[in-house]
Interface confidence: low
Amino acid sequence: RGVFRRDAHKSEVAHRFKDLGEENFKALVLIAFAQYLQQCPFEDHVKLVNEVTEFAKTCVADESAENCDKSLHTLFGDKLCTVATLRETYGEMADCCAKQEPERNECFLQHKDDNPNLPRLVRPEVDVMCTAFHDNEETFLKKYLYEIARRHPYFYAPELLFFAKRYKAAFTECCQAADKAACLLPKLDELRDEGKASSAKQRLKCASLQKFGERAFKAWAVARLSQRFPKAEFAEVSKLVTDLTKVHTECCHGDLLECADDRADLAKYICENQDSISSKLKECCEKPLLEKSHCIAEVENDEMPADLPSLAADFVESKDVCKNYAEAKDVFLGMFLYEYARRHPDYSVVLLLRLAKTYETTLEKCCAAADPHECYAKVFDEFKPLVEEPQNLIKQNCELFEQLGEYKFQNALLVRYTKKVPQVSTPTLVEVSRNLGKVGSKCCKHPEAKRMPCAEDYLSVVLNQLCVLHEKTPVSDRVTKCCTESLVNRRPCFSALEVDETYVPKEFNAETFTFHADICTLSEKERQIKKQTALVELVKHKPKATKEQLKAVMDDFAAFVEKCCKADDKETCFAEEGKKLVAASQAALGL
């Protein structure tokens, strides 16, 4: 019952152009090119996209026309390799162009940069944006796709089309409002925050596929879809998992046209079969395509069937456990994961995967034993500590969050993680710890039954950011170990790290703690980042500093900034008071 059985097409590019329509085709090609050549100017990408689009149209008119039978990778790769400045701008990435497909595409993929050296996006004045939007709406929206795609080379392309649609709607509505800024700015903030979260979630999916393989991704998908669709049969869930795996494999592999096309097919299938999938899909399925796909991806869990029998009967008490396992290991483990997950919407996906791994390890050992049943009879008892560990951790951290508030909770995590992995760059530690700290306001407000799936699955996404940033410039064996050994045990691995006793403290550098009047004009968020950067540097200089010592220095620092920002001669205040602060901090920390 695969959704994706298709006849072979004479021209792949014509097939995708017809399926997706010109507007989506052009947008997706622009995203693909910007995700590969992240440093190229906007105008160059637009030119390449227009050339590809014109060529696609000739293939739609005549599928037998010259080059129309070439694969999309060949067509797109040939086009990217026409960029004149490839060697100067990208260095060794230009060597990809000497390769044949499919190695050339693999080569481009390997050069995607999760942290490209691009300027921060600065938001212009509202009137300036509205004028640009009215003057040339098409260029304005293309620019949005380009800027997001080049900064987020794994952004889920069909979802980026959905964001662009909302971006356009925001400008269409707000640029004619009485108070343009009051209307537009909250919408843009929401899109920015949701966009960052969407990018990070997709980055985890791609890392899961690329670093741990299809089996790991499918296991994740079985668990998540079983929680979401507990009334669906195992065969239905398996079918959805297979199709979802194809969609994400394509998007993570740069096959964005195929990915968007197949995602649309999957949404269509789900809506046509919602009676056997979930009762929660009705509203989603009434929406237009982009909204429909997004809505399905975010849909709430359906209610659990009332009459689910005990798991023990089939997976512990049955005399056929080893026989069923031996006959089809992955199918049997998939059924175990499905049955466990549909009964436990209160567990995180990663916890469910740890339980399935424990069950698998037990069967591997016990099915070779003299008395298998006796050996695996207590397997469910082994689950107890695995369940309690994240429960306790979340309880403790939510209590800490409620006591401190978000900013100070982030600071506690900054100190904690800097002590664990002090070799990691300061910007990475600040970014990751700030995001880890957001788990408090995101998840601690939920009732007990929703806390763990919210918190631990969010932490998996954030820790993956640390892993991909660290992989670009590896500096810590401990980070490498936690990131590569087991996808589902990353969070417990980082949680278990103690202070790195082998770390040699950084030399003290007064320049790091020299501040200027420009800090006064920063937004609250940017000011927090400055202070948190200083905090990480302090811990790197004095990793054995106590909480109390660090708190005293940070309080002094906050007072110093407040005082100098109120001064008439701010710059002089920062220079003179700054020296005193550095001296006092050195004394307080014994530097």
């Epitope: 072979a8 694969s71 299809e214």
Partner: nanobody, 115 residues
Framework: QVQLQESGGGLVQPGGSLRLSCKAS????????MGWYRQVPGKEREAVAT???????FYANSASGRFTISRDNAKSTVYLQMNNLKPEDTGVYSC?????????QGQGTQVTVSS
């Protein structure tokens, strides 16, 4: 565990034909594009033909018009029909999914074209 088992190679005279088979296991064969590759000692492994999950075939210039790639998803097998073989087609032929998600490839099957 991803496994790929190629067969069908052998010694053949110029102008002759061979049909190579590659049986795959350990992954969902039907959703991946597959490729046949040729390895000649001292040279980089090169793609001869690839076939998308939907069944669209693509060929290297050297194989176009002489080779035909096909797949049977029910049997998790990809085939390469090679006609009008030339001495420069000699090499070890192996198959694998074209995605970077799998690093696996089979042992390959030797094809020798010689009179």
């Amino acid at each position: 565990q991803v496994q790929l088992q190629e067969s069908g190679g052998g010694l053949v005279q110029p102008g002759g034909s061979l049909r190579l088979s590659c049986k795959a296991s350990g992954f969902t064969f039907s959703i991946y594009s597959m490729g046949w590759y040729r390895q000649v000692p001292g040279k980089e492994r090169e793609a001869v033909a690839t076939i998308s999950s939907g069944g669209s075939p693509f060929y290297a210039n050297s194989a176009s018009g002489r080779f035909t790639i096909s797949r049977d998803n029910a049997k998790s097998t990809v085939y390469l029909q090679m006609n009008n073989l030339k001495p420069e087609d000699t090499g070890v032929y192996s198959c694998s999914p074209i995605t970077s998600i799998f690093k696996a490839q089979g042992q390959g099957t030797q094809v020798t074209v010689s009179s």
